[in-house]
């Protein structure tokens, strides 16, 4: 056969689907690799061919589209399972070709099992809700295209093993789940089960997502530098180790980049010759507010180092702040004999 543009195994599209549920999988060629869509390709006389390699096998084989009740079918650029079985797990390839053109890509499909509380190896999307922010909603994801708009499915929402009913502040509203006022206790995994009829059969779609309650933008403030501050003076003798922590609190801000850095005499530590090390640690509160600590360390400080300006800087989407550390050289204690002599007025 003639050469085919092989895009290899697209591991970025690690598709996971639940056992015994419908799954519709679009050929990734048209979404990520080619500059034209399926309709254009079809109009140009190109044919889409599907085949697969079973898990732990090397042999590529055609997909059996003649199974009872059309369990596996193809519609335009979509491969349908109605429903999936555990042994459908494998690498699937879609190939677009005619006599003069060929392009193909493979992708892994994993059929996973869930337990009665919807626990599974499925990677869960995370939806962040602002704490005490008023009504916020999550929507049952990835159910488009499974049934026509004329079909009215039933949707049941669960938190873990439990149907969401009579909750204080969470109300199921069809495809949406409304949080009247999100609290820390609302953190967790939420599952929607969509049930719909098709050709005399009943199918279920299960979708689980993780809700994480985070700090509200209403409460967000610019970075707060807790250390260095005006109350602590770093007083050292030459030869001692100088350790100055810069501790900064950042309110949670969606998609904000939090930065902390030191300057020494107005320059970044990398741009000066002194032997300085910076160690950073990060901790988060339950609402994902962040505390960053950068410890500036000079193993053997010189009298010259003790005259420098050490400034901690912090920046987030809410603003930029800076604070200088109070560093000074320790005055050596006067020698005992001299002190006595001076005390008696000796010359």
């Amino acid at each position: 056969s003639e050469r085919c543009d092989d895009w290899g195994l697209d591991t970025m599209r690690q598709i996971q689907v639940f056992e015994d549920e419908p799954a519709r999988i679009k050929c990734p060629l048209f979404e990520h690799f080619l500059k034209f869509n399926y309709s254009t390709a079809h109009s140009a006389g190109l044919t889409l061919i599907w085949y697969w390699t079973r898990q732990d096998r090397d042999l590529e084989e055609p997909i059996n589209f003649r199974l009872p009740e059309n369990r596996i079918s193809k519609e335009k650029d979509v491969l349908w399972f109605r429903p999936t079985l555990l042994n459908d797990t494998g690498n699937y390839t879609c190939m677009l070709r005619n006599t003069t053109y060929c392009s193909k890509v493979a992708f892994p499909l994993e059929v996973v099992q869930k337990d009665s509380c919807f626990n599974s190896p499925m990677k869960l999307p995370v939806h962040k809700l602002y704490i005490e922010y008023g009504i916020q909603r999550i929507t049952c994801p990835n159910v488009d295209g499974y049934f026509p708009s004329s079909v009215k499915p039933t949707i049941t929402w669960y938190m873990g093993c439990y149907k969401i009913q009579n909750f204080n502040n969470v109300i199921p509203e069809g495809m949406n789940l409304s949080f009247l006022i999100a609290l820390i206790s609302n953190n967790g995994n939420y599952t929607c089960v969509v049930t719909y009829p098709e050709n005399g059969r009943t199918f279920h779609l299960t979708r689980t997502l993780t809700v994480k309650v985070v700090g509200s933008p209403k409460n967000a403030v610019p970075p707060v530098i807790h250390s260095p501050n005006d109350h602590v003076v770093y007083e050292k003798e030459p030869g001692e180790e100088l350790l100055i922590p810069c501790t900064v609190y950042f309110s949670f801000l969606m998609d904000s980049r939090n930065e902390v850095w030191w300057t020494i005499d107005g320059k970044k530590p990398d741009d000066i010759t002194i032997d300085v090390t910076i160690n950073e640690s990060i901790s988060h509160s339950r609402t994902e507010d962040e505390t960053r600590t950068q410890i500036l360390s000079i193993k053997k400080v010189t009298s010259e180092d003790l005259k420098r300006s050490y400034v901690c800087h912090a920046r987030s989407a809410k603003g930029e702040v800076a604070k200088a550390a109070k560093v000074k050289q320790k005055v050596p204690a006067p020698r005992y004999t001299v002190e006595l002599a001076c005390g008696f007025g000796a010359t």
Partner: antibody, heavy 122, light 107 residues
Framework: QVQLVQSGAEVKKPGSSVKVSCKAS????????IQWVRQAPGQGLEWMGY????????DYAQKFQGRVTITADESTSTAYMELSSLRSEDTAVYYC???????????????WGQGTLVTVSS | EIVMTQSPATLSVSPGERATLSCRAS??????LAWYQQKPGQAPRLLIY???TRATGIPARFSGSGSGTEFTLTISSLQSEDFAVYYC?????????FGQGTKVEIK
């Protein structure tokens, strides 16, 4: 170690109500459900309903709808089961039980209270 | 609701012998089945969940098997402390339901 401690035995007249308490010791890391199960003398176990104290969610078995009310006081880590319009066949030991989390499939009854005997007699 | 039927109602076994208890569901419950042990005057204790997974601290002589509608609890070598009533429970569908129990007594 989480423990569930229930209130003491009760003797009630037919037509009256009883309220059994179940206090949890050990603060949970995340939401959990308290289940109520009863057992008539010499009989099997019968699930009555549950409550999720931190979220307020609850549900009751069809058989007890309209007669049972399960509530919780988060501040004292105590759940309550109230059964009204008592009749002699409600004579039973009433148990509360719980799991560690809302997500533990098959382990929603892994910690049990000691049981509360409710006798309904005229 | 799903009806759970246990058999036999009473099982007479000598210490050291094997005991096999059955539980049947009126419809498939997949592997969503638990077993509990209850001794006189005590609360039930979780033995097995997921049809075959032993709960924390349960001795290896207790094992569970089955899926769908037919389940078995096996006690490989009965100890004196194992004489009790055993209940199965399905948690596949609400309401969660228990079997009527099997009493394991000393022969």
């Amino acid at each position: 170690q989480v423990q569930l401690v229930q209130s003491g035995a009760e003797v009630k007249k037919p037509g009256s109500s009883v309220k059994v308490s179940c206090k949890a010791s050990g603060s949970p890391a995340e939401p959990y459900a308290i289940q109520w199960v009863r057992q008539a003398p010499g009989q099997g176990l019968e699930w009555m309903g549950y409550i999720i104290p931190s979220l307020g969610g609850y549900d009751y078995a069809q058989k007890f709808q309209g007669r049972v009310t399960i509530t919780a006081d988060e501040s004292t880590s105590t759940a309550y089961m109230e059964l009204s319009s008592l009749r002699s066949e409600d004579t039973a030991v009433y148990y509360c039980a719980r799991g560690q989390t809302l997500y533990a499939s098959g382990r929603q009854f892994d910690i049990w209270g000691q049981g509360t005997l409710v006798t309904v007699s005229s | 609701e799903i009806v759970m039927t246990q058999s036999p109602a009473t099982l007479s076994v000598s210490p050291g012998e094997r005991a096999t208890l059955s539980c049947r569901a009126s419809q498939s419950v997949s592997s969503n089945l638990a077993w509990y042990q209850q001794k006189p005057g005590q609360a039930p204790r979780l033995l097995i969940y997921g049809a075959s997974t032993r709960a924390t601290g349960i001795p290896a002589r207790f094992s569970g098997s089955g899926s769908g509608t037919e389940f078995t609890l096996t006690i490989s070598s009965l100890q004196s402390e194992d004489f009790a009533v055993y209940y199965c429970q399905q948690y596949n569908n609400w309401p969660w339901t228990f079997g009527q129990g099997t009493k394991v007594e000393i022969k």
